[in-house]
Interface confidence: medium
Amino acid sequence: AAQPNNSLMLQTSKENHALASSSLCMDEKQITQNYSKVLAEVNTSWPVKMATNAVLCCPPIALRNLIIITWEIILRGQPSCTKAYRKETNETKETNCTDERITWVSRPDQNSDLQIRPVAITHDGYYRCIMVTPDGNFHRGYHLQVLVTPEVTLFQNRNRTAVCKAVAGKPAAQISWIPEGDCATKQEYWSNGTVTVKSTCHWEVHNVSTVTCHVSHLTGNKSLYIELLPVPGAKKSAKL
């Protein structure tokens, strides 16, 4: 059917959510003075969506047993940043920390957690809390992986050929098709760590009516649909 501006809106547009928060913190009930008997060091891989808020937690040690808390932050291409708090003198110290979005959640004598408000693509890296206590040192590390939702488009660029693009996602999205066609997929890597995936498919079978591009990504999946129009050179675009 005739389409204004030759364009088709195919599915709901990219979701707009209020800034979400995520945390791997334990609650007070899980805090134990016998933590040393359980685990001395924990490292967690943590995928977090860009533009959300994240809270990173120290080991569940009661603050009264604390001597020093140190957050060590290693981001790609930057010198190591440390944020330290010494309980005895109630003083905090920062070294090489320039990103104002990474802060203590509140006063470190009340809460040792670190917050990132909001998470940016540059916050990919390793975050480690080191708690010095009379019973020894306890660590909790986070390999923070910032996830970026790709912008997805689908259009027909030639007779019975469709192109599906997942632009600037992190990590790279995966693209599959229903029904399967004769497909070629390319990846383009950007300096900020995002990846654009482009899949071009051709369907020789003439009874294929609509094709579905299914984009799988850690931030969520999307399916787009387009009708194969028998018009050489016709370009129907559909941006999510």
Epitope: A1, A2, Q3, P4, L8, M9, L10, Q11, T12, I178, P179, E180, N207, V208, S209, T210, V211, T212, S223, Y225, E227
Partner: antibody, heavy 122, light 105 residues
Framework: EVQLQQSGAEFVRPGASVRLSCTTS????????IHWVKQRPEQGLEWIGR????????KYAPKFQDKATITADTSSNTAYLQLNSLTSEDTAVYYC???????????????WGQGTSVTVSS | DVQMIQSPSSLSASLGDKVTMTCQAS????LNWFQQKPGKAPKLLIY???NLEDGVPPRFSGSGYGTDFTLTISSLEDEDMATYFC?????????FGGGTKLEIK
């Protein structure tokens, strides 16, 4: 408000032809596709075919290729289904429905006519 | 043509029950679900396998991928008594399943 208004019930003799109409309002017929669907008494749904009213292009299910002809008149926002060489097998309710071209349900049959009953009997 | 097998062909359930029905295709497809009440035209419930059409109660949900699809009603209500059809729109000719007739016990 989007509506598809179909013509009234038809009683026809075997071998005759009939033309059913589907007049739309609330949208421009030329922007969308119109499909026709057959439902025999107490049976399932069968896709007959569709038309792109903007250019008259049609697609038919093979079993209806020689039975049905779909046309459209954009000036009156009306689509038609002509059925020829009628037999008792053609006794059914026939629905028109649109395939929306302009938003997320473009490929779905989101609005339907009320149906036209066709009875073929001698 | 793509064959669409719906099962069961009929089912009886009580109010408040969770109800599921399936549609199996002979090819990988995308599909829509419709509800039809006696003497009425079909009504679109779900498009693109899992997307709820505007105005459809959230107790309805669709799932599946490829060739196997499910329509679920999380808590059956009186007004859900109807016949449910699936439709594939990936290949021409478009084809419907044979329907699942849902009755209230």
């Amino acid at each position: 408000e989007v509506q598809l208004q179909q013509s009234g019930a038809e009683f026809v003799r075997p071998g005759a032809s009939v033309r059913l109409s589907c007049t739309t309002s609330g949208f421009y017929i030329k922007d969308d596709y119109i499909h026709w669907v057959k439902q025999r008494p107490e049976q399932g749904l069968e896709w007959i075919g569709r038309i792109d009213p903007a250019n008259g292009n049609t697609k038919y299910a093979p079993k209806f290729q020689d039975k049905a002809t779909i046309t459209a008149d954009t000036s009156s926002n009306t689509a038609y289904l002509q059925l020829n060489s009628l037999t008792s097998e053609d006794t059914a309710v026939y629905y028109c429905t649109r395939q929306l071209g302009l938003r997320r349900t473009w490929y779905a049959m989101d609005y339907w006519g009320q149906g036209t009953s066709v009875t073929v009997s001698s | 043509d793509v064959q669409m097998i719906q099962s069961p062909s009929s089912l009886s359930a009580s109010l408040g029950d969770k109800v599921t029905m399936t549609c199996q295709a002979s090819h990988t497809i995308n599909l829509n679900w419709f509800q039809q009440k006696p003497g009425k035209a079909p009504k679109l419930l779900i498009y693109g396998t899992s997307n709820l059409e505007d105005g459809v109660p959230p107790r309805f949900s669709g799932s599946g991928y490829g060739t196997d699809f499910t329509l679920t009603i999380s808590s059956l209500e009186d007004e859900d008594m109807a016949t449910y059809f699936c439709l594939q729109h990936t290949y021409l000719p478009w084809t419907f399943g044979g329907g699942t007739k849902l009755e209230i016990k």
